[in-house]
C-alpha cells in the first residue's frame, strides 16, 4: 500500500486534535529527555509509513500497541482519509481477535511510544530540511 | 511474497563478533517491518532486534549495546552484527519479514550461533 494519495492535511488535523494528545496520555509519567530518539521519515507517505510499522507491529520488547486508544483512532484516520487503506487491514483485524488481551505497558513500549511522537512530529512539518 | 535465507552462524569464543545476514528474495522486503529472533535450547523463540522499512531499531534490553541491526533495502538484506557475545547468546537465530499491512510474516530457516565460554 502507497500512502501517496492521502489527504494529509485531514490527517494532520485528526492528529492535532486528538492522536497527540492520546499520545501524551500514553507517555504520561515520563520525562520528555528520557528517551533519546532519533527518528526521521523523508516525507509524509515515509512518516505514515513508518507510523503504521510502529502502531501496528510488534517490535523488539514491546508485544502490541494496537489496542491503544492513539493506535485506534489513527487507524480509523488512516481508513476514512486514505483511499484503499482499510482493504489492507483483513487479516491483521483478524489476527488481533486471537491474541490475548492482557495489557502492560512496558519500558520498551513506552520508548516506541516515543519513536512515534516523533514521526507524527516530523509529518507535521514536511517542509522541514532532514536533519 | 518474501524468501528469506540466513547466514553467518558458527562458533566463537566469548567476547568475540559476529555477523548474520538475511538474504531476501520475492516483493515487499522493502516496506515489511525486520526482524531477528533468538530461540535457545529449551526456550520460546524470542524477538530480539526489530527494524523498519526507514531504518528505525528497537532491541530487548539483553542485547541493547551489543547487537545492530541494520538493512539494505538496495540490496534485500538485513544484518544482525553481535558483539561482545556471551554464552547465553547461544542459539538459533532467524530473521522474519512482516507486511506491515496485514501482519503476514515469512521466516528463514535459521542460522545457528554457538558461544563457547
Known amino acids: 500500500y502507497d500512502f501517496t494519495n492521502c489527504d494529509f492535511e485531514k490527517i494532520k488535523a485528526a492528529y492535532l486534535s486528538t492522536i497527540s494528545k492520546d499520545l501524551i496520555t500514553y507517555m504520561s509519567g515520563t520525562k520528555s529527555t528520557e528517551f533519546n530518539n532519533t527518528v526521521s521519515c523523508s516525507n509524509r507517505p515515509h512518516c505514515l509509513t513508518e507510523i503504521q510499522s510502529l502502531t501496528f507491529n510488534p517490535t523488539a520488547g514491546c508485544a502490541s500497541l494496537a489496542k491503544e486508544m492513539f493506535a485506534m483512532k489513527t487507524k480509523a484516520a488512516l481508513a476514512i482519509w486514505c483511499p484503499g487503506y482499510s482493504e489492507t487491514q483483513i487479516n491483521a483485524t483478524q489476527a488481533m481477535k486471537k491474541r490475548r488481551k492482557r495489557k502492560v505497558t512496558t519500558n520498551k513500549c513506552l520508548e516506541q511510544v516515543s519513536q512515534l511522537q516523533g514521526l507524527w512530529r516530523r509529518f507535521n512539518r514536511p517542509l522541514l530540511k532532514q536533519q | 511474497e518474501v524468501q528469506l535465507v540466513e547466514s553467518g552462524g558458527g562458533l566463537v569464543q566469548a567476547g568475540e563478533s559476529l555477523r548474520l545476514s538475511c538474504a531476501a528474495s520475492g516483493s515487499g522486503f522493502g516496506v515489511n517491518i525486520l526482524y531477528w529472533y533468538r530461540q535457545a535450547a529449551g526456550i520460546e523463540r524470542e524477538l530480539i532486534a526489530s527494524i523498519t522499512s526507514g531504518g528505525i531499531t528497537n532491541y530487548v534490553d539483553s542485547v541493547k549495546g551489543r547487537f545492530t541491526i541494520s538493512r539494505d533495502n538496495a540490496e534485500n538484506t538485513m544484518y544482525l552484527q553481535m558483539n561482545s557475545l556471551k554464552a547465553e547468546d547461544t542459539g538459533v537465530y532467524y530473521c522474519?519479514?512482516?507486511?506491515?499491512?496485514?501482519?503476514?510474516?515469512?521466516w528463514g530457516q535459521g542460522t545457528l550461533v554457538t558461544v563457547s565460554s
Open positions: 522474519a519479514s512482516r507486511n506491515i499491512f496485514d501482519g503476514t510474516t515469512e
